[in-house]
Each structure stands twice: as structure tokens, then as C-alpha cells.
């Protein structure tokens, strides 16, 4: 028996369902009573789902997995993983045994889009050209860790004086806080881009500081 899986990782959004595809070619006269199907975590060998003696033995993995019972006899051994979590990420092995056996591994990559960044300025009043200000760009509930880029109004990358921290919450999703420290000019726009490297999703935020609210010192 030859087992086939998709070579590319399966990308699944958090809280959606994912299908880990696995198939085999049944011989003529094949019956499900002959099939021993095991889905397990590749690294730890922990059982995820099994089918033996013509029966679906059910999920051994937080009761969120299911087979496609009507398609098994056709050689479709795919696994449905419901309400995907960050902790589901990793490699899964599909093991099929009839008379002989074969197995193959499929990777699950979990992702969650980042929210539109919120921008804060400190201090946020009595600003004068030449003042040092701190601009914070915050984006929430994404996965995996983000890449953060800062640019000025002319699109010039700002790399100095940037501090970025990423903290995972109880669900494993990241909240990103990136802090840019700059010396104010007469006016300027500062933008941050939070990129999800798996989804290739960009979330943009910007703040524009104009001359209007600024109090210019009197000219000598």
C-alpha cells in the first residue's frame, strides 16, 4: 500500500477547520475490516485518531478530529481537524496498514491575521520641533510572530531606535508592541507595517504630526 499526502504545508486559520489530506490506493476487493488507519503526531507518536477492525475508534486528540467515513473505502484517509488552535501546529503522520503498510507526514501551519495597528504618541501635546517623541504601534491576536517595519513620510525605512516586543496570550496568539523614538521635525508622517509572514498579510498604521498643533519657538 502506498500512502500519499500533500507535500506543501496545510495553512489553517485559528478557529477554522483544516483537512490534512492522506490517500491510499485500495486493491480490488478491499474492505474496511482490513484497514488499520492511524493518525499520530510525528514527533511524539501521540495518537490523534484511529480506525481499526472496520470501526472508527474516534479522536484521541481533544475530540476535535474526524475522518471521512464514507470516503475511506475509496482510499481517502484524510483527517478533519476542527477549531484549529496554535498548539495544533506541527507534523502529523498518516499510517495505513492493510496487508503491508506505509506512512507519510503532512505539516500543519497555523496562522492568525494581525489587527489594524493602533498608534499612540507620547507626549501627545505641547510638541515642538526638536522634541524627542515615542510612537507606539500596537497590533493584536496574530500568529506566528510578526515582522514590523517603520517608515517615514518619504518611505525611508526607520531602523534605529526601534524596540519591538511580542507577547503570546493564553491562546498562543501574539500581541505586538513596537516603539519608535524620533526627534520631531516641523511635520512628518510615521507609519508602521505589521506583517504576518505566513499569510503574507500586511496591517498598516500611521500617525501624522503637522505644524498646526506645534508651538514654534520665536525666531531670534
Amino acid at each position: 500500500v502506498e500512502v500519499q499526502v500533500s507535500e506543501d504545508p496545510v495553512v489553517a486559520l485559528v478557529d477554522t477547520d483544516a483537512t490534512l489530506r492522506c490517500s491510499f490506493s485500495p486493491e480490488p476487493g478491499f474492505s474496511l475490516a482490513q484497514l488499520n488507519l492511524i493518525w499520530q503526531l510525528t514527533d511524539t507518536k501521540q495518537l490523534v485518531h484511529s480506525f481499526t477492525e472496520g470501526r472508527d475508534q474516534g479522536s484521541a486528540y481533544s475530540n476535535r478530529t474526524a475522518l471521512f467515513p464514507d470516503l475511506l473505502v475509496q482510499g481517502n484517509a484524510s483527517l478533519r481537524l476542527q477549531r484549529v488552535r496554535v498548539t495544533d501546529e506541527g507534523s502529523y503522520t498518516c499510517f495505513v496498514s492493510i496487508q503491508d503498510f506505509d506512512s507519510a507526514a503532512v505539516s500543519l501551519q497555523v496562522a492568525a491575521p494581525y489587527s489594524k495597528p493602533s498608534m499612540t504618541l507620547e507626549p501627545n501635546k505641547d510638541l515642538r520641533p526638536g522634541n524627542m517623541v515615542t510612537i507606539t504601534c500596537s497590533s493584536y491576536q496574530g500568529y506566528p510572530e510578526a515582522e514590523v517595519f517603520w517608515k517615514d513620510g518619504q518611505g525611508v525605512p526607520l531602523t534605529g531606535n526601534v524596540t519591538t516586543s511580542q507577547m503570546a496570550n493564553e491562546r498562543g496568539l501574539f500581541d505586538v508592541h513596537s516603539v519608535l523614538r524620533v526627534v520631531l521635525g516641523a511635520n512628518g508622517t510615521y507609519s508602521c507595517l505589521v506583517r504576518n509572514p505566513v499569510l503574507q498579510q500586511d496591517a498598516h498604521g500611521s500617525v501624522t504630526i503637522t505644524g498646526q498643533p506645534l508651538t514654534f519657538p520665536p525666531e531670534a
Epitope: I38, A60, S97
Partner: antibody, heavy 116, light 106 residues
Framework: QVKLQQSGADLVKPGASVKLSCKAS????????MHWVKQRPGQGLEWIGM????????NYNEKFKNRATLTVDKSSSTAYMQLNSLTSEDSAVYYC?????????WGQGTTVTVSS | DIVLTQSPASLAVSLGQRATITCSAS?????MHWYQQKSGTSPKRWIY???KLASGVPARFSGSGSGTSYSLTISSMEAEDAATYYC?????????FGAGTKLEIK
């Protein structure tokens, strides 16, 4: 005929580990799930976990997940269970059993006594 | 986890009388298996797939049930039937056993 031969009785100290063996014969070892079951004196049967010798896939009772480790040696058709951090509550008879439409064949059991 | 509740916990039956042990599952299961264990020996598979008798099991034993309610019945109690009987399911993970019913001769 199917036979599961388990290792002899063990006397171990609290906090220590024990590794029990179950040698299978009379059938194709790699084709069947092997289960492990605990029975305290005068008590009922408690499922510990199972292993499939062909894939090494394991499934544990949550109660034993962090202390029990199931392994197999395909070349000798032997299943093993290691139990760590033993306490007096682990004093029991431990059985291995082959799964074929129920646990159709059982080992004779290994008595583990935890005492200082 | 599916909890299997056996009743009664113990049962004394006269020779030749009928004995019934029940096993109630906390959620529906597809099959029930039964094991017999005598003191100082390993359990033996006795009834599998709800109603099939294991090899060597006398025809006076029968099993039935579906969903959440299953039973093992001995039509005419004999001395050799005195033992503890356990029900067990593996329709859903994890596999679970009932607490056992001790069957004695009255």
C-alpha cells in the same frame, strides 16, 4: 496460539521507576494494538494506555500520561511499560493485553510492590 | 470520558437461576465488551461486540444492548460462573472499564 509472557514481580522503592516487559508470540506482533491495564488489590481494571507496534503510535489515559511510557522492540516482539515516580498507589498487578475485537489475550500479570 | 456504570456492584444468584448484569454508559457507544475475572487470575475476554461469545464461553451466556444501555445475562447460573465481570468500551477515546460486578452463588 497467542501468548503474552510478562516479566516477574518487582519490589521497588518510592520515587523509583520500574520497566515491565511483555513478550508476544504466536501472532504477528506488529499488526495489533497492545494495551496495558492496572489492577490494585481488590479493585477493578484501570486502562493505562496502548501502543501500536507498527507505527509506535501511543495513546495514554490522562491520569498516566506524564508517568507512563510505552515502547516496543519489534525485533523481539516485546512491549514495554516504564512507570516513573512510583508511590504506594502504584502497588498493583499490571497486565498487557492484545486488542482484537476486545482484549482477546492477556498476559499473566506482573505484580509491582512499592515499599521502602 | 465515557463513564461506564455497572449494576449491581455484587449479585448472589442461586444455581439454575437467571443472572443479569447491566452496564450504563454516560454517552452512546457502538459496542460493549465483557470480561470475566476469577480471583488471582488474568481477565478473560468473555463477550465482544456486544453479543458475540468468545471462544469457549458457554451458550448460557448472552449479551445485548445499544446506545447507552448494555447487559450480560446468564440464563441458568452454574458454579463455575462465579466471578467478577467487567464491561468495557472503546467506541470513543479513552478506553474505559466499568467498576465490575461480583457474581456469587447464593
Amino acid at each position: 496460539q497467542v501468548k503474552l509472557q510478562q516479566s516477574g514481580a518487582d519490589l521497588v522503592k518510592p520515587g523509583a521507576s520500574v520497566k515491565l516487559s511483555c513478550k508476544a508470540s504466536g501472532y504477528t506482533f506488529t499488526s495489533y494494538w497492545m494495551h496495558w491495564v492496572k489492577q490494585r488489590p481488590g479493585q477493578g481494571l484501570e486502562w493505562i494506555g496502548m501502543i501500536h507496534p507498527n507505527s509506535d503510535g501511543t495513546n495514554y489515559n490522562e491520569k498516566f500520561k506524564n508517568r507512563a511510557t510505552l515502547t516496543v522492540d519489534k525485533s523481539s516482539s516485546t512491549a514495554y511499560m516504564q512507570l516513573n515516580s512510583l508511590t504506594s498507589e502504584d502497588s498493583a498487578v499490571y497486565y498487557c493485553a492484545r486488542w482484537s475485537y476486545g482484549m482477546d489475550s492477556w498476559g499473566q500479570g506482573t505484580t509491582v510492590t512499592v515499599s521502602s | 470520558d465515557i463513564v461506564l456504570t455497572q449494576s449491581p456492584a455484587s449479585l448472589a444468584v442461586s444455581l439454575g437461576q437467571r443472572a443479569t448484569i447491566t452496564c450504563s454508559a454516560s454517552s452512546s457507544v457502538s459496542y460493549m465488551h465483557w470480561y470475566q475475572q476469577k480471583s488471582g487470575t488474568s481477565p478473560k475476554r468473555w463477550i465482544y461486540d456486544t453479543s458475540k461469545l468468545a471462544s469457549g464461553v458457554p451458550a448460557r451466556f448472552s449479551g445485548s444492548g445499544s446506545g447507552t444501555s448494555y447487559s450480560l445475562t446468564i440464563s441458568s447460573m452454574e458454579a463455575e460462573d462465579a466471578a467478577t465481570y467487567y464491561c468495557q468500551q472503546w467506541s470513543r477515546n479513552p478506553l474505559t472499564f466499568g467498576a465490575g460486578t461480583k457474581l456469587e452463588i447464593k
